[in-house]
């Protein structure tokens, strides 16, 4: 007496299932139900997505279309993708930044804010990993600058300059007094 | 036991408006279609509205426009709201369940009726 | 709308017959493999019971005696031995589509 029987739809293919009354058919992506079917194994009536929505899978009951998502301009967003019917906008960075998760258990879904990308030349050193998905990776000095505490310092123009162990090792010089 | 009471029937002038109700028991309303159904004296069935259990509600021409099927799943109760009222609406009207073994209109229990009469 | 058209309209029998009613739709009510007729039993002053589903199911609680046939446009309702708590009038309905329709009705008295 519980009504916990779901009679199984019959139909032809296998994307049926009752809405309302009878077994209709879904939806396909990129389209809302705008009235369930009104005979057995029917087609419903199904709506395209107006502009700015989308839905990306076939689906039976949604009444209407998800809102595309806006990327967020504060944190430098772009659209990689722009929202269509059956997908919403795809969010991310423009070139030369990168994506900075804004939760510990980054997933791609994930709140997100662009960060500039370290330009490893303007610190005198190597690129060892382009950035896209993380930070630039930046290797050792440039010909010419040697380590230095953090950073990368030019070899002395003359031989009046100081040039400690580590300077002469890779600029070739001598400390002279 | 499954129970359908209708009440809410009555004498009202053409034009006129009247809600009827019919209050559920012995099963999960909320699981099961419903309809309303009415037979004019000594005449034939005629199917009047149906609300679906995910929240459809169907009319055949004759009534749309006038007449609003409703449900109060917590309250396990079907309604029909009718406006505009002529003297061909003058009937009994049933509530019916439909039933649940089925993905196709069918009704499984009724109620006794409810009496409606249109005249001025 | 389809429309159902029972014959006869009353007929007159005595306890123990074979009573066989027909109902005819204005088009066929059989898609994807099923016969969407159904049949009740309405006795004066009372509700309609459900007899039949899909044209030859029984519904529970309902006498073997009953049984119902057809497909396409043209069904019937057999009753193999008429007891004396069977006279009343039968109803055929489809849910071929919307709207649902009953046929006009088939009053079986007693003779």
């Known amino acids: 007496q519980g009504g916990t029987r779901s009679p199984r739809c019959d139909c032809a293919g296998d994307f049926h299932k009752k809405i309302g009354l009878f077994c209709c058919r879904g939806c396909p992506a990129g389209h809302y139900l705008k009235a369930p079917c009104t005979e057995p194994c029917g087609n419903s009536t199904c709506l395209v997505c107006p502009q700015d929505t989308f839905l990306a899978w076939e689906n039976h009951h949604n009444s209407e279309c998800a809102r595309c998502q806006a990327c967020d301009e504060q944190a430098s967003q772009v659209a990689l993708e722009n929202c269509s019917a059956v997908a919403d906008t795809r969010c991310g960075c423009k070139p030369g930044w990168f994506v900075e998760c804004q939760v510990s258990q980054c997933v791609s879904s994930s709140p997100f804010y662009c960060q500039p990308c370290l330009d490893c030349g303007a610190l005198h050193r190597h690129t060892r990993l382009l950035c896209s998905r993380r930070d630039t990776d930046c290797g050792t000095c440039l010909p010419g600058f040697y380590e230095h505490g953090d950073g990368c310092v030019s070899c002395p123009t003359s031989t009046l300059g100081s040039c400690p162990e580590r300077c002469a090792a890779v600029c070739g010089w001598r400390q002279m007094f | 036991e499954v129970q359908l009471v209708e009440s809410g029937g009555g004498l009202v002038q053409p034009g006129g408006s009247l809600r009827l109700s019919c209050a559920a028991s012995?099963?999960?309303?909320?699981?099961?279609?419903m309809s309303w159904v009415r037979q004019a004296t000594g005449k034939g069935l005629e199917w009047v509205a149906a609300?679906?259990?995910?929240?459809?509600?169907f009319y055949p021409g004759s009534v749309k426009g006038r007449f609003t099927i409703s449900r109060e799943n917590a309250k396990n109760s079907l309604y029909l709201q009718m406006n505009s009222l002529r003297a061909g609406d003058t009937a009994v009207y049933y509530c019916?369940?439909?039933?649940?073994?089925?993905?196709?209109?069918?009704?499984?229990?009724w109620g006794q009726g409810t009496l409606v009469t249109v005249s001025s | 709308d389809i429309q159902m058209t029972q014959s006869p309209s009353s007929l007159s029998a005595s306890v123990g017959d074979r009573v066989t009613i027909t109902c005819r739709a204005s088009?066929?009510?059989?898609?994807?493999?099923?016969?969407?007729m159904h049949w009740y039993q309405q006795k004066p002053g009372k509700a309609p019971k459900l007899l039949i589903y899909?044209?030859?199911n029984l519904e529970s609680g309902v006498p073997s005696r009953f049984s119902g046939s057809g497909s396409g446009t043209d069904f019937t309702l057999t009753i193999s031995s008429l007891q004396p708590e069977d006279f009343a009038t039968y109803y055929c309905?489809?849910?071929?589509?919307?709207?649902?329709?009953f046929g006009g009705g088939t009053k079986v008295e007693i003779k």
């Open positions: 012995g099963f999960t309303f909320s699981n099961y279609d």
């Open positions: 609300f679906s259990s995910d929240g459809y509600t």
């Open positions: 309905q489809h849910s071929r589509e919307l709207p649902l329709t």
């Open positions: 088009k066929s009510v059989s898609t994807s493999g099923y016969s969407y």
């Open positions: 899909l044209a030859s």
């Open positions: 019916a369940r439909h039933a649940d073994y089925a993905n196709y209109p069918v009704m499984d229990y």
